[in-house]
């Protein structure tokens, strides 16, 4: 390439291999690359490698990233995971069985510990596993929102489809909401999208977690592909060190 | 400022002039300025002033205008608008009065003199201007479909106000359909949120352009504030240019 | 668009993103991520001639300018436009981490 | 942000967003657009200093690196951010014309 | 290649009048103005008129207004200048030309000489 | 209506000479001004517009600046085909009016 001068493409190239080190350390907060020392031997753990490869998937219904808020989105955010409550568990048996719902709770104090504020919080998605889909469904995400009321979040058009397929719902502001609150459990409900003439408002898709011999009919759980709460977060100590910087430029 | 070497702020600002004299002809695709010679005398006209206003006015539900395409949204954009066809039409008694919903109705031979093909629509919005609301409501937008069915585009969870406000749906692949059917007169239909328990599902909110006497009682319009669709377009011209340098760079 | 499918297909002289494959182990030196090995971090190469003046022949210019300064900058220049994030994997202590680095993976360029 | 708010009411050396207001008719002598008859268009300007090398002293660059050069440029350059469309109203012959310009107004910029 | 080609020479008596045509190609006839200019004997270039053929807009110089008629047939992509009442001074080539909007005339026809004699 | 007075009407010269023709208006045409070339027999041609645009196609020698009322072209090396009359023609006000025009000849 030449403009006036030739650039020298190595050159550039080794300028930007150095300054991806200290981006990567940087985004890190890390003064030097963390010892080795203690890392167990062996593979990486199941969960740790699942997690990973849920952070690295595009899925359905999550945007590609938006420009990055200036100075706490440069950071880097831990990812972590926390799983619905197993269905078995009594809170659902306060919700009544439907044709048109299907009820995902969560335990705060499980967020608490991957999230100690919510501030430090910079995204949550509900994913869901849907098995295939034989015809077009709309659907609609609601959070629980006092005794018993919903509040309305979302809405998505599901695609027929033969194979099965992660949803993502951007859930951040409840899930920071739910940090702020004294709440044990919180959740969420999926409905079929219900207009003011139609009859038919069967929820026809199938989640991953849940048996259908009839829907609410709430049973099993399969595997860890049951609905969970995918989370990014700064961790503590980082969020300490942006405080303490705050006030420079 | 001072760099390595001292920055002469004018020079930039000089420059930067220069080159947004550049990038305005060069957005129009004029090679020089247009001729001022066979401007009426006097004021510009009301509906253009109107038609300015509502563009450079953001409003409700719309969003900053995200990073463009790099070739075609370069160009500029000609701002036209259709009116809703005025309720005293006939075909608006197909139409049952509901408490739930009113309709909108848009003639395409309008949108057609307006964007002459498909492709050359970059953008369109309907916009609604909702009076005065007591309480919170949530509505959904529906595009007509085929004889009596509807299909759901989008929603808003509108929060009470004492003033007057515009609401702004993109409707843009709605539109490109519309301007690519024979159909002649198309419409949309603004509905309260129905979920599938609820009982009390009246549109509360009121829309300008129709008289409130009872929800679907459609009559009056008040004055050019009926709903509209604001379009931009790439004219005609200006995209036989960009076809021609396609294959250029 | 000046992104990956055009510009790793052409040999584009103006302003375009250029391949770059980092291997953490070879070009940083580094073991301590487990996961990726390394990833495609592409960068932004090339000039953005400023093409406008009171006395140019405007016509020649007229198409070139919403590829070298459609932002109309006094000195445009050739920088990200789409960019993607990486996770990664890594421990601290006995501790596996996963975290997302924004904006890693430089996926198209502008001139700005 | 390296936004308006912040960049009008600081003497920031380094990459901000600077004033600029053209008037269509004392900047470029045009009569030609009836409205607006100008805008705030501004630019970016100030150095984005490349803040890394093996021997920096790392703990003290730290702090600045998402602010010169978060997207590890070989070269960071202050780049417009946020931008904003300009409406305007012209006359072909006798004809008026309202027209939207995209990305004609400068609300912050980044070092990129 | 954009073209406008305009009719052949024409010999009229002074009262006459007589019917100038003009056949563009290559573009979209109604997407620009046409206008009319005439060159007396030795003289300078002198504008009469301009038509939009898409709206059927018409705009006279005031020397010509009453005398001289402007049309288009947009099936055939063809303007027509029609002078009455000619006298001898209107003895011209006259000239159809294609309006850009940037106020110049950027393609001509070739002229026609109008001949007014007794 | 706007005057457009032209100089000189008419001037010899030589092939490779630099040669410039003026225009003055009545009134301030804020840079809307053209010039045209004709040759007998042959349909007029654009050469350059709003002041110093050159048309396509035109030869780089031909060139044009001024501003306000005072235009100018100039061709900087004269080549046997530039043998033919010049006419200016301001695009500002209706109607369009035109220099009476300046004849070049050869030397």
């Known amino acids: 390439l030449s403009t006036c001068k030739t650039i020298d493409m190595e050159l550039v190239k080794r300028k930007r291999i150095e300054a991806i080190r200290g981006q990567i350390l940087s985004k890190l907060r890390l003064a030097s690359p963390p010892s080795q020392g203690e890392v167990p031997p062996g593979p990486l753990p199941e969960a740790v490698l699942a997690l990973y490869n849920s952070t690295r998937d595009r899925v359905a219904g999550e945007s590609a990233e938006p420009e990055p808020e200036p100075e706490a989105d440069y950071y880097a955010k831990e990812v972590t995971r926390v799983l619905m409550v197993e269905t078995h568990n009594e809170i659902y048996d306060k919700f009544k069985q439907s044709t048109h719902s299907i009820y995902m709770f969560f335990n705060t104090s499980e967020l608490r510990e991957a999230v100690p504020e919510p501030v430090l919080l910079s995204r949550a998605e509900l994913r869901l596993l849907r098995l295939k889909l034989k015809v077009e469904q709309h659907v609609e995400l609601y959070q629980k929102y006092s005794n018993n009321s919903w509040r309305y979040l979302s809405n998505r058009l599901l695609a027929p489809s033969d194979s099965p397929e992660w949803l993502s719902f951007d859930v951040t502001g409840v899930v920071r909401q739910w940090l702020s609150r004294g709440g044990e459990i919180e959740g969420f409900r999926l409905s079929a999208h219900c207009s003011c003439d139609s009859r038919d408002n069967t929820l026809q898709v199938d989640i991953n977690g849940f048996t259908t011999g009839r829907r609410g009919d709430l049973a099993t759980i399969h595997g860890m592909n049951r609905p969970f709460l995918l989370l990014m977060a700064t961790p503590l100590e980082r969020a300490q060190h942006l405080q303490s910087s705050r006030h420079r430029r | 400022l001072s760099t390595c070497k001292t920055i002469d702020m004018e020079l930039v600002k000089r420059k930067r002039i220069e080159a947004i004299r550049g990038q305005i002809l060069s957005k129009l695709r004029l090679a020089s300025p247009p001729s001022q010679g066979e401007v009426p005398p006097g004021p510009l006209p009301e509906a253009v002033l109107a038609l300015y206003n509502s563009t450079r006015d953001r409003v409700a539900g719309e969003s900053a205008e995200p990073e463009p395409e790099p070739e075609a949204d370069y160009y500029a954009k000609e701002v036209t608008r259709v009116l809703m066809v005025e309720t005293h039409n006939e075909i608006y008694d197909k139409f049952k009065q509901s408490t739930h919903s009113i309709y909108m109705f848009f003639n395409t031979s309008e949108l057609r003199e307006a964007v002459p093909e498909p492709v050359l629509l970059s953008r369109a919005e309907l916009r609604l201007l909702r009076l005065k609301l007591k309480v919170e409501q949530h509505v959904e937008l529906y595009q007509k479909y085929s004889n009596n069915s509807w299909r759901y585009l989008s929603n808003r969870l509108l929060a009470p106000s004492d003033s007057p406000e515009w609401l702004s749906f993109d409707v843009t692949g709605v539109v490109r359909q519309w301007l690519s059917r024979g159909g002649e007169i198309e419409g949309f239909r603004l509905s309260a949120h129905c979920s599938c328990d609820s009982r009390d599902n009246t549109l509360q909110v009121d829309i300008n352009g129709f008289t409130t006497g009872r929800r679907g009682d459609l009559a009056t319009i008040h004055g050019m504030n009926r709903p509209f669709l604001l379009l931009m377009a790439t004219p005609l011209e200006r995209a036989q240019h960009l076809q021609s340098s396609r294959h250029r760079r | 668009a000046l992104d990956t499918n055009y510009c790793f297909s052409s040999t584009e002289k103006n302003c375009c993103v250029r391949q770059l494959y980092i291997d953490f182990r070879k070009d940083l030196g580094w073991k301590w991520i487990h996961e990726p090995k390394g990833y495609h971090a592409n960068f932004c190469l090339g000039p953005c001639p400023y093409i406008w003046s009171l006395d140019t022949q405007y016509s020649k210019v007229l198409a070139l300018y919403n590829q070298h300064n459609p932002g109309a900058s006094a000195a445009p220049c050739c920088v990200p436009q789409a960019l993607e994030p990486l996770p990664i994997v890594y421990y601290v202590g006995r501790k596996p981490k996963v975290e997302q680095l924004s904006n890693m993976i430089v996926r198209s360029c502008k001139c700005s | 942000a390296l936004d308006t708010n912040y960049c009008f009411s600081s003497t920031e050396k380094n990459c901000c967003v600077r004033q600029l207001y053209i008037d269509f008719r004392k900047d470029l002598g045009w009569k030609w657009i009836h409205e607006p008859k100008g805008y705030h268009a501004n630019f970016c300007l100030g150095p984005c200093p490349y803040i890394w090398s093996l021997d920096t002293q790392y703990s003290k660059v730290l702090a600045l690196y998402n602010q010169h050069n978060p997207g590890a440029s070989a070269a960071p350059c202050c780049v417009p951010q946020a931008l904003e469309p300009l409406p305007i109203v012209y006359y072909v012959g006798r004809k008026p014309k309202v027209e939207q310009l995209s990305n004609m107004i400068v609300r912050s910029c980044k070092c990129s | 290649e954009v073209q406008l080609v305009q009719s052949g020479a024409e010999v009229k008596k002074p009262g006459a009048s007589v019917k100038v045509s003009c056949k563009a190609s290559?573009?979209?006839?109604?997407?620009?103005?046409m206008h009319w200019v005439r060159q007396a004997p030795g003289q300078g270039l002198e504008w009469m008129g301009r038509?939009?053929?898409?709206?059927?807009?018409?705009a006279y110089a005031q020397k010509f207004q009453g005398r001289a008629t402007l049309t288009v047939d947009t099936s055939t992509s063809t303007a027509y200048m029609e002078l009455s009442r000619l006298r001898s001074d209107d003895t011209a080539v006259y000239y159809c030309?294609?309006?850009?909007?940037?106020?110049?005339?950027?393609?001509w026809g070739q002229g026609t000489l109008v001949t007014v004699s007794s | 209506d706007i005057q457009m007075t032209q100089s000189p009407s008419s001037l010899s010269a030589s092939v490779g000479d630099r040669v410039t023709i003026t225009c003055r208006a009545s009134q301030d045409i804020t840079n809307y001004l053209n010039w045209y070339q004709q040759k007998p027999g042959k349909a007029v041609k654009l050469l350059i517009y709003?002041?110093?645009r050159l048309h396509s196609g035109v030869p780089s020698r031909f060139s044009g600046s001024g501003s306000g009322t005072d235009y100018t072209l100039t061709i900087s090396s004269l080549q046997p085909e530039d043998f033919a009359t010049y006419f200016c023609?301001?695009?500002?006000?209706?109607?369009?009016?035109f220099g009476q025009g300046t004849k070049l000849e050869i030397k």
């Open positions: 030309a294609r309006w850009d909007y940037g106020g110049y005339f950027d393609v």
């Open positions: 709003y002041t110093s």
């Open positions: 038509i939009d053929p898409q709206s059927g807009g018409i």
């Open positions: 290559g573009y979209t006839f109604t997407s620009y103005w």
């Open positions: 023609q301001q695009g500002d006000t209706l109607p369009w009016t």
